[in-house]
């Protein structure tokens, strides 16, 4: 059964110091979001019982395991049903507890019955405050049954309910006829699924035989111990003023458990915890009574003396229940109530026995579920006692259950039973998930679902390169951190698979399913540098840049150049996807703009270093373009443009730029500069015979203007071959600008 | 479908007898109280007599009380009122009906009515 | 024994609201239903001062305080033509006291 206990509060008469607590003694209970189990849930559930709206009560979780509900105003918040959810998947298991108001006009005799399928159930409910009016019987809410106020027997109203099945469970109340529901006795019946010492599907097997209270659940034949007690068979007594699965927890304040009404998973119910009695659970046990509510019996024999919470301690010589058994008979020794083992393996176990005469191998046995009798290997012969070791065949699920160690020796018997479980290593159901890539590391979140049992005690990442047959690596990780594969070679395909592990020998599963993950390009390394620019008008740059020279192919796909105005905080970025570029033509710039400018190589989606920055000052923008540029041919060297000056100028020009270049050229274009503003034809000189020249020209004032069209003109034939050209305008002839 | 059908009703004469029996059908007759009301000719509702689920509790409107029993069979699920010394003030439609408490409330209503049975004591 | 006093009849023109009274002595610390009875049919619950039964509209409401229990009523149609009856339980003896009764007309 899952390990969950709802606790009540009672001792505390002030609703506003009261509280309930559910505490969870699961691994990995109540940590919300996390992969391994699902939250705590405490609440009040007024489907059954409705009592008069309240502020909303305040839940306080303390730690994974335990959660605290308070905020109650007045005593009528705390009558009703509160409900207590915990485990995960197929354990989640809810707890219930039934609060009932100490000034009832009636009260549960007894709050929680636990009775067999088929039994007779009977609640009673004491008369508190008298009222002679019919008295109405509820089940879950709906009505049930009435009785006549003059059929109250010595006080009590009584339902008797015969033969009762599972679907009769449930929340019962007794109420007088037009009373408030404040005023009822609340009861809760639990209806196991089979008859008494029997559980599982057709209630064919046989229940361990719980002590000390303990109910056996009809489902997993596990016994639901009673506050105090653990062990399978609830054989074993928690010290005082603990309880939980494994004694583990602790009640709080300083008188122990007093006050506390502890709510463990169905088939128990509810009751106060070992030692206490009561409606309240502040009386302490009668002498010669111990155990939950006081319900159990000391009757101890050769001078054992009773102990409220644990029933009878034995003098020297003397064990057992009732300390009835002599020491000579031989006693199993420290058997552990509950082994975990994982499914295919060969555990060895070992069982320890005592008496006179001395127990020896040959006289302890160990006897599986299905009835097969195994017989140790070997014995440990100490002076106190003789340790047989066991070792067991390849474990199947069918050897989950109860295993029991027996000895014989002629002093007498003793068997101790214990659950073995079985677990089934756990089998990732999908492949890791990647988070992110780089060229040499892969981040990969491991947390999967899974087959099998946890709790997940490692996480084993294999992976290699894809389609490869080396072996493969290996890393292991916390389960629920992120995993980082380093040292991978950039651009390569990596199979990858989850290996999940649960706690002891042989608890690795089958590794998961593959997915494959790829690695980023490797980052580009060469740094480049900004070779010169030129501004090839108002809002036009013409870039160029040089890489250092590097044996070996280049890492790279392109170039980014990126242009920073930091007068707008705006950003330029032009991308160049050809690796082999070395300039680039920047259009639509802001003309006038001061631009911080650099140039990255970059592969795949990542740069390499920038080059150091340059500052570039584009001109303000010019004039408009000249007007109706014409080229007439003179000779086989020379060609005369002639041109209008352009139209509504800003200001006087100070000089006009022509740009020659041949027809289909690959080159550069040429810049000559026409400083006399005033003329409006030029001859362009030094040209080649029979070849087509393109042109065209632009104004400057503050900066460079328009281009004008672009005219085309052949220089005459049978010239030579001229040294390049040059210009000469109408007044004289001037030299060469480029 | 929950149903209550009565029967044996019919012409008596003054200080005759007469039994009413009414068949439940459709829920566990015997966790209801059950009672019979009757109406006169042209006059208003009458409460008669009430039973208890058990049948060992029985309460009676004092206008019957010492002339009418009032008694159940659980395990036929039917409901009777002898009637006894009948007079021409007996004379009336006679419903039985089922006694129900609401959820989340305490209090009692009739939630199911018979057709009813006609009673006539005339000489 | 309870005495609860009902007016004879109540006439409504369609669509306008009918308020129908009880009075008894204490009565607003009972529970007081109502039924509803056509002619030639068995009575049919149809109110009480804290609930309403499945399939009885909404325009059917009531309350109840001091000595008068009020049942309402509203946007009245032709079918709502019936005797209305309030009831109250006296546990005094298990007893179960009607009104007398109050014929409502849809004029």
């Known amino acids: 059964a899952v390990d969950l206990t709802l606790l009540a509060n009672l001792r505390l008469t002030d609703p506003q110091r009261f509280f309930l607590t559910c505490v969870s003694g699961e691994a990995g209970a109540g940590r919300g979001s996390d992969a391994w189990g699902p939250p705590l849930l405490l609440e009040k559930d007024d489907r059954i019982v409705r009592t008069p709206p309240g502020p909303p009560l305040r839940l306080a979780r303390n730690g994974s395991h335990q959660v605290t509900l308070r905020g109650f105003s007045k005593p009528s918040d705390l009558v009703g049903v509160f409900s207590c959810v915990g485990g995960a998947g197929a354990r989640r298991t809810r707890v219930i507890y039934v609060h009932n108001s100490p000034g009832a006009h009636l009260l549960p005799d007894k709050v929680t019955h636990t009775v067999n399928k088929g039994d007779t159930a009977v609640l009673s409910a004491r008369v508190h405050k008298e009222k002679q009016t019919d008295v109405i019987w509820k089940s879950n809410g709906s009505y049930f049954y009435t009785l006549d106020w003059h059929e109250a027997q010595d006080g009590r109203f009584l339902l008797q309910l015969p033969n009762v099945q599972p679907p009769s469970s449930g929340i019962y109340s007794a109420t007088y006829l037009e009373a408030s529901p404040l005023g009822s006795a609340f009861f809760r019946l639990i209806v196991r699924g089979c008859g008494a010492g029997r559980w599982g599907p057709g209630c064919t097997k046989e229940c361990p035989g719980c002590l000390h209270g303990g109910v056996c659940h009809d489902h997993d034949g596990e016994c639901v111990c009673p506050p105090g007690f653990t062990g399978t068979r609830c054989e074993q007594a928690c010290r005082e003023g603990r309880f939980g699965q494994s004694c583990q927890e602790q009640c709080p304040g300083i008188s122990g458990c007093r006050g506390l009404t502890f709510c463990l998973p169905d088939p128990y119910g509810c009751s106060c915890g070992s030692g206490w009695r009561g409606s309240q659970c502040q009386e302490a046990c009668a002498p010669g009574h111990f155990g939950a509510d006081c319900r159990l019996q000391c009757q101890c024999q050769n001078g054992g003396t009773c102990d409220r919470f644990s029933g009878c301690v034995c003098p020297s010589g003397w064990h057992g229940v009732h300390c009835e058994k002599s020491d000579r008979i031989p006693q199993i020794l420290n058997m552990a109530s509950e082994l975990e083992f994982n499914l295919e393996t060969m555990p060895r176990i070992n069982c320890a026995a005592a008496g006179n005469p001395f127990p020896v191998r040959g006289s302890i046995e160990l006897r599986k579920p299905d009835g097969t009798v195994l017989l140790s290997t070997k014995a440990i012969v100490e002076p106190e006692k003789t340790t047989a070791e066991f070792e067991v065949p390849r474990l199947v699920l069918a050897d989950s259950g109860f295993w029991e160690c027996r000895v014989s020796t002629s002093g007498g018997q003793d068997s101790r039973r214990f659950k073995v479980n079985v677990k089934v290593p756990p089998v990732p159901l999908a492949a890791p998930r990647l988070l992110t890539k780089q060229s040499r590391q892969l981040v990969v979140s491991p947390l999967v679902s899974f087959s099998g049992d946890g709790p997940i005690s490692t996480v084993r990442l294999h992976y290699r390169p894809q389609d490869s047959t080396m072996d493969w690596s290996t890393i292991v990780v916390d389960p629920s951190e992120n995993v980082t594969l380093m040292n991978l070679r950039p651009k390569t395909g990596y199979s990858v698979r989850v290996q999940l592990s649960r706690p002891g020998e042989g608890g690795e599963g089958a590794w998961g399913p593959p997915t494959l993950m790829t690695t980023d390009c490797p980052e580009p390394l060469l740094q480049p540098w900004l070779e010169g620019w030129h501004v090839e008008g108002t809002d036009r740059l013409r870039v160029s840049w040089s890489l250092p020279l590097v044996p070996g192919p280049l890492v790279g796909d392109g170039f980014l150049l990126r242009l920073w105005d930091g007068t707008r905080g705006q950003e330029r970025r032009e991308n160049v996807s050809s690796p082999q570029a070395r300039t680039a033509l920047l259009t639509g710039l802001t003309p006038g703009t001061h631009y911080q400018l650099d140039v990255q190589l970059y592969h795949c989606t990542l740069l390499g270093p920038a080059s150091p920055p340059a500052h570039v000052l584009l001109p303000p923008s010019g004039p408009p373009a000249p007007r109706h540029l014409h080229a007439q041919a003179l000779s086989d060297s020379e060609i005369q443009l002639t041109w209008k000056h352009p139209e509504a100028l800003p200001g006087p020009i100070s000089k006009y730029v022509v740009e020659v270049q041949v027809a289909g050229g690959a080159g550069d274009p040429l810049w000559i500069d026409v400083d006399r503003p005033e003329e409006t034809s030029t001859i362009i000189r030094g040209l080649n015979a029979s070849t087509r020249y393109l042109f065209r020209m632009r104004a400057s004032i503050q900066g460079l203007g328009d281009w004008s069209n672009t005219v085309e003109e052949s220089t005459l034939g049978n010239g030579l071959q001229a040294e390049g050209p040059v210009q000469e305008s109408r007044a004289a002839e001037e030299g060469l600008d480029q | 479908e929950v149903q209550l059908l009565e029967s044996g009703g019919g012409l008596v004469q003054p200080g005759g007898s007469l039994r009413l029996s009414c068949a439940a059908s459709g829920f566990t007759f015997s966790k209801y109280k059950m009672l019979w009301v009757r109406q006169a000719p042209g006059k208003g509702l009458e409460w008669v007599s009430v039973?208890?689920?058990?049948?060992?509790?029985?309460y009676y409107a004092d206008s019957v009380k010492g002339r009418f029993t009032i008694s159940r069979d659980n395990s036929k699920n039917t409901l009777y009122l002898q009637m006894n010394s009948l007079r021409a003030e007996d004379t009336a439609v006679y419903y039985c009906?089922?006694?129900?408490?609401?959820?989340?409330?305490?209090?009692?209503?009739?939630?199911?009515w018979g057709k009813g049975t006609t009673v006539t004591v005339s000489s | 024994q309870s005495v609860l006093t009902q007016p004879p009849s109540v006439s409504v023109a369609p669509g306008q609201t009918a308020t129908i009274t009880c009075g008894g002595n204490?009565?607003?610390?009972?529970?007081v239903h109502w039924y509803q009875q056509k002619p030639g049919q068995a009575p049919v619950f149809v109110y009480d001062d804290n609930d309403r039964p499945s399939g009885i509209p909404e325009r059917f409401s009531g309350s109840n305080s001091g000595n008068t229990a009020t049942m309402t009523i509203s946007r009245v149609e032709a079918g709502d033509e019936a005797d209305y009856y309030c009831?109250?339980?006296?546990?005094?003896?298990?007893?179960?006291?009607f009104g007398s009764g109050t014929k409502v007309t849809v004029l």
């Open positions: 204490n009565i607003g610390t009972k529970s």
């Open positions: 039973i208890y689920p058990s049948g060992g509790y029985t």
């Open positions: 009906a089922r006694v129900v408490v609401p959820a989340f409330y305490y209090y009692y209503y009739m939630d199911v």
């Open positions: 009831q109250v339980w006296d546990p005094t003896g298990d007893q179960y006291v």
